[in-house]
Structure formats: C-alpha cells, structure tokens
C-alpha cells in the first residue's frame, strides 16, 4: 500500500498556503482527486509529488494515491481542508445525475471541519426539502440523499452557519432519472391493412416509456416518413404518437410499414403489411378434403377459411340433401376471426345419423359477390348380411346380400356341425367371391352386393356362413340346413340395430 506524507488523514491549511503531498510506493504511483486548480504533479520513479504554492478553497477535497501495478489495488488517501472564512463550501459539480433509488451525492465539501455542526441541505431560494427526503452529511463528501426519487429532481444548496448567519453554497441541480427497463413499448395499428384503391386509410405508430428521452419513427419499405409527432404523458409514461392518414390510397402506398422506437437501452420495432387491391375480394378455402368419409355415429367438424375485403355481409351453412330437408342447427355453426380479413367458420356435426350424409355448402357474401364451398359427406357403415336358400335355373343356391360402405368383400365358409359362426377348427371349405354383383350403389347410400353359392346337395350336419367385411367392420350370417327345411342364424350382434 502506498504511503502519503504528511501521514495524517486530514490536513487543514489557510488560503494561499503551499501544500506538498508526497506519495511513495513499491512501484510507480499515481495521484487522483477532484478536478481542482493550481496543482502541479511531479513523478520520480516510485514517488509522486502533488503540490500547489497557492491553495484555494477549491483545493478542498480527498486526494488518493494508488499503485497501478499493485494486484491488491491498495490506495492511501488524505483529505485537504482549505479553510476560507468567506467560502465555507467547495462545490465539485453543477449537476448530479443518478437513477431512481440510487443514493445521490451532492458534492459540497466543507472547507472548515469546525462548521460541521451547523450544516443543512435546502432547496434553492430557501425552500425546505420535500417531505420524506432522507439525507446524511459527510464533511469529506457532502450531502447524500438516500434512495433518490424522480420527484426530488430539484436545485439544492448547502447551508453552513458562520458567525450566526447561514452561508449558502452555489446551487447543485439534481436530476433523478427513471430506471428504463428496456426499449420503449410499441404499438402499430392496425396489424394488417387492406384497402381498395381510392379508399382512405390510417396507420398509427405509438411508443411509450417511463423516460422522455426516446425517439420513434414510422418507415415505409425502409423509407423514414416525415409525420408530425403528438406527445402526451399519462399513467406515468411518456407517449409519442405518429399518425399516417391517407385520403385516397394507391398501389404505391402498399407494402411493409415499420414502427421503430429507440432509447439508451436499445431499439424495438414492429411491422405490418398494407395491401392495396383493385376491387373487393372474397376467397373461400378449406384445409380439409372437400370429400369426407366418416363412420356413422362419429362426429365431424367442417371448416372453411374465408379471406375477404370488405367484411362479410352474410354467411350461412346449407344442407343440400339428398336425404331430408333438414338444415344445420345454427348452434352448431361457429365463427372465429383469425384477424381482420381472415375468418374460420366451423360446422359441428356430432354423432352422425344416416340421414345426415350428403352435401353441405358454406355460402358467404360481401360487396365482391357470393361464394360457396361445398363438402360431400359420405357415411361409412359396417356390413349387414342376410342369406336365403333358393333355386336358380333349377340349381339349389345360397344367396347372400351384404350392405355397407365402403363396398363389402364377401367370403363363404362351410364348416362342420351346427354353429352361429364357423371357427377355424370347424372350417371345411372357404370360397372368396372377388366380384360380388353390385345391386345398388347410389351416392351417400350404402352399397349392396349379392353373392351366390351354388350347392348341389345341402349337407345336413353342416353350416354355411356368408361373411362380409370392409374398412369399418364385418358382418356374417350362418345358414343351417335342417330336415324340415332351412334355418338361418344371423349373428347376435345384428339382432339389435341401434
């Protein structure tokens, strides 16, 4: 640690005195202190001399000697008082700038330590301090206002009692800056804009911050626009608003608009796109396939995306048949607005019944005209099967009818014994019918197919089963020949139709 001579913490001298402060260290040493006049510095290897031959009250202050090469960063200090009976204060600053909740040091240094008992801090023109001002005093450093607030940004003076009268220092302006959490907050309205050529438009860019020192501008395709700024202060925030008014838009007004605000903390920007169109438009689309297949009893949501300008004047869902003249219940139709010009319309069809298959159309209208988007809904059914015994061209034939959607495939099984359903162990013979005859195939209906199995002689201790399957499920019908005729067994699950 460097050593200062004279080796006293404080030195009191009179104006005009010669002061010589010597600092010695192991390596090179440096003096530092307030920017006061008349000092001369002389360095000589490991010592440095700070001297003046005409001390004034302005030399009052703390002088510190450091050894730059010392890894521990040790320093020594001496405080000099230049005791001027006419000047009790040496003010080191015209202005003090701090952030809110920091301590604000007002650097009026007392030139005579004896005066410490009679010091006080006042606002200029003798006004008292604001309520709740918490401050302390150090003769070496001055007055400290603790946890300074924005409202305490004032002009202050230091007061000392000299011979029974108060002597004021020159004033110090305290600026307490609000802590700026980041760049200004921004809004750009609207987020998207569409106008027909010739219409009027307005774009508003606004920024706000706790501190007045920030800039905001609006740019169009990277060109800064010259727009008059409106300023305001409310809710403890400064607001700056730029409003672009266009009476008759044209194609050159289209493009990207950016609202940019910046302060010492950085920059924020937000953008929007302005589209200028020749005429009104209305576009309908769906992310879904327009041809839908759903299993009976399940639910389906039909969704249509609408892009339109100007806004919609009307819209509705319509059932176009073929089964009934029922119309979708309004409570099942739902509309959500994605943004100003894009909307999603949903029709919910829960627990679909056979009569609800068919065409559903969404219709919308705006000044650009009508548009429609139609979905075709086909229901899927598991096969239903029935078998009868008949004679065709004199031959005994088993006739299997299977009805379902998609079109069922048919397989015949012959198995031993009498059973409702052939299992693997009993199967004697299997016939696949790759091309059953299609009896009916209308849009939105089940497909009915027929398969024939010619049987020369019915074996009485055997069962003939017709099985049909599609992507939804399977169905079967067991035919058991008995002496008194034929007996058929539909499987249990087809005895009850929900």
């Amino acid at each position: 640690i460097p050593v200062i001579e004279p080796s006293v913490p404080e030195l009191v001298v009179k104006p005009g005195a010669t002061v010589t402060l010597r600092c010695v260290g192991n390596g090179s040493v440096e003096w530092d202190g307030p920017p006061s006049p008349h000092w001369t510095l002389y360095s000589d290897g490991s010592s440095s001399i700070l001297s003046t031959n005409n001390a004034t009250f302005q030399n009052t202050g703390t002088y510190r000697c450091t050894e730059p090469g010392d890894p521990l960063g040790g320093s020594a200090a001496i405080h000099l008082y230049v005791k001027d009976p006419a000047r009790p204060w040496n003010v080191l600053a015209q202005e003090v700038v701090v952030f809110e909740d920091q301590d604000a040091l007002l650097p009026c240094l007392l030139t005579d330590p004896v005066l410490e008992a009679g010091v006080s801090l006042v606002r200029v023109r003798g006004r008292p301090l604001m309520r709740h001002t918490n401050y302390s005093f150090s003769p070496w450093h001055g007055f400290t206002i603790h946890r300074a607030k924005f409202i305490q940004s004032q002009d202050y003076q230091c007061s000392a009692l000299m011979g029974g009268r108060k002597v004021m220092s020159i004033s110090i302006r305290l600026k307490v800056q609000k802590v700026i959490p980041g760049p200004p907050a921004l809004t750009l309205v609207p987020a998207e804009l569409v106008r027909i050529r010739g219409e009027a438009a307005q774009i508003v860019c606004s920024a706000s911050s706790v501190d007045v020192n920030f800039d905001v501008f609006l740019q169009h395709n990277n060109t800064k626009l010259a727009i008059p700024q409106q300023s305001d202060f409310h809710n403890n925030r400064y607001q700056k608003v730029l409003t672009l008014n266009l009476d008759q838009v044209d194609f050159q007004h289209a493009g990207n608009y950016s609202c940019v605000a910046s302060n010492v903390q950085g920059k924020h920007s937000t953008s929007m796109f302005f589209r200028v169109v020749e005429s009104a438009y209305l576009n309908l689309s769906s992310e879904q396939n327009l041809i839908q297949e759903v299993t009976v009893g399940e639910g389906l949501n039909l969704k249509v995306m609408v892009e339109a300008y100007p806004g919609l004047q009307g819209f509705n869902w319509t059932y176009l048949g073929p089964f009934s003249d029922h119309q979708p219940e309004p409570k099942l139709a739902n509309a959500t607005t994605k943004d100003t010009y894009r909307h999603t319309f949903t029709l919910s069809l829960p627990r679909l019944k056979p009569s609800e298959a068919g065409r559903y159309s969404f219709l919308a209208r705006n000044p650009g005209g009508w548009r429609a988007l139609t979905f075709e809904l086909t229901l899927r059914y598991p096969p239903e099967v029935s078998v009868i015994w008949t004679f065709i061209n004199g031959s005994g034939t088993l006739l299997c009818a299977a009805s379902g959607y998609p079109q069922p495939n048919v397989t015949w099984l012959q198995c031993s014994g009498h059973t409702d359903r052939c299992d693997e162990a009993q199967v004697l013979q299997v016939w696949d019918d790759p091309y059953p005859e299609v009896l009916s195939q209308e849009p939105f209906h089940k497909v009915t197919v027929q398969s024939l199995l010619t049987v020369e002689t019915l074996e009485h201790n055997q069962t003939y089963e017709c099985r049909a399957h599609n992507s939804v499920g399977s169905g079967s019908w067991a035919f058991i020949p008995i002496s008194a005729g034929a007996h058929t067994h539909p499987p249990d699950e087809f005895l009850f139709t929900p």
């Epitope: 202190g33 920017p35 003090v96």
Partner: antibody, heavy 117, light 110 residues
Framework: QVQLQESGPGLVKPSETLSLTCTVS????????WSWIRQPAGKGLEWIGR???????NYNPSLKSRVTMSVDTSKNQFSLKLSSVTAADTAVYYC???????????WGQGTLVTVSS | QSVLTQPPSASGTPGQRVTISCSGS????????VNWYQQLPGTAPKLLIY???QRPSGVPDRFSGSKSGTSASLAISGLQSEDEADYYC???????????FGGGTKLTVL
C-alpha cells in the same frame, strides 16, 4: 490496460438528441472522472464535460443547456446526451479518462456523429 | 475560436529541434499546469506531456515541455518522420472549471 469504446448512432437528424455510450474495460469505472471531448472535421478539440462515478457532472458552459451525462457503474459505462443538435454538432466524439491535473490519459478511438436530415 | 493560441503549422527536417508555442491567460495557463497531446492522422489524441513537463511512461525523452507565465511550449528534438502529427496544448480554465485546448499545430517533417 484500460480501454474505452464509444457507441451510438452515427447519424442524427437536426433538432433531435444525440446519444452516445462509452464502455470501459480492463479496469473499474469507479473513483475516476470521465470526460467527453469532440473534434469537428479538420478542427481542434473541444471539451464537452465530465462525470464522476457518483453522478457529479461539470459541463462546458457553451453546451451546458443541451448536455446531460450519466453513469452506470454496474455496466462500467457512462453516457452523453446532447439535445437539439444542429449541423455544427457534427464531429468525432471521444470519451476519455480525466486525471487530477486535468489531463486525459486514456481515450476511446472516437465515433463520428453526423447531424443531417 | 480556441481559448489557447497555437501556430497552425510548424515544420522541420529529420534530426532538427522544433518548438511549438501555446499562449493563454491568467485563468488557464497562468494559474494551472499545461498538458500536451499528439494526434496521429486518423487516430485519437495521445497524452504526451502532463503537468507542464512530465512525460508519461513510453514517451521518448525527445519530447519536453515548459511553462512561463501565461505561455507554454513543447520542444521536439531529434525530429523523426513518425513525429508528423497534430499537437494540442490543454489546460484547466478556472472560469469554466473545465479543460480548454489550443487550436492545434500541424507538424510536418520535411
């Protein structure tokens, strides 16, 4: 080794506020005075003002009404704001450490600020 | 208009001694010490002399400073081509509690 680095916009519009920040590295900002000095192209140096780490400031009287300096010891930074700028404020702006004896021992490399619309 | 007055230019040949003057008033040079800065083209100024005649470490002893009354001078002996630069004097000015500079002297090494 103490190093200083000025940062801020290189272009400012007339009547707007010029804002610069000086970041100190290689040493602490504390317990020193820090100054801003400017130099118009082809001209001499002009002292703008100084700030101590406690926030105490002194400004050149010719600029005092337009200048605000502040310090952020937590970031080892100090800053300059010059309001209502005109073309006459176009210059290279330097930040520097000021020592007892009123000399500047460390300087930033300088940043050119142009005032133009 | 600079507060301290310096000649706008000075020149010398390699090996020569050159002196640059700086004159002020009682509120600056008259009552405070003088500092000198060297500014090479395109760079920041560099401290050359402080407290009238003190050289920071790294500055060659070819550079020396002196002060008398309200004037000061910088002397460069054994002039070298790398000394070609602008030189500024500076001092505290009591009337503004700040630093004032000279207008600068452009030194050309012929």
């Amino acid at each position: 080794q103490v190093q200083l680095q000025e940062s801020g916009p290189g272009l400012v519009k007339p009547s707007e506020t010029l804002s610069l920040t000086c970041t100190v590295s290689g040493g602490s900002i504390s317990s020193y005075y820090w100054s801003w000095i400017r130099q118009p192209a082809g001209k001499g140096l002009e002292w703008i003002g100084r700030i101590y780490t406690s926030g105490s400031t002194n400004y050149n009287p010719s600029l005092k009404s337009r200048v605000t300096m502040s310090v952020d010891t937590s970031k080892n930074q100090f800053s300059l704001k010059l309001s209502s700028v005109t073309a006459a404020d176009t210059a290279v702006y330097y930040c520097a450490r000021e020592r007892l004896g009123m000399f500047f021992d460390y300087w930033g490399q300088g940043t050119l600020v142009t005032v133009s619309s | 208009q600079s507060v301290l007055t310096q000649p706008p230019s000075a020149s010398g040949t390699p090996g020569q001694r050159v002196t640059i003057s700086c004159s002020g008033s009682s509120s600056n040079i008259g009552s405070n010490t003088v500092n000198w800065y060297q500014q090479l083209p395109g760079t920041a100024p560099k401290l050359l002399i402080y407290s009238n005649n003190q050289r920071p470490s790294g500055v060659p002893d070819r550079f020396s400073g002196s002060k008398s009354g309200t004037s000061a001078s910088l002397a460069i002996s054994g002039l070298q081509s790398e000394d070609e630069a602008d030189y500024y004097c500076a001092a505290r000015d009591d009337s503004l509690n700040g630093v004032v500079f000279g207008g600068g002297t452009k030194l050309t090494v012929l």
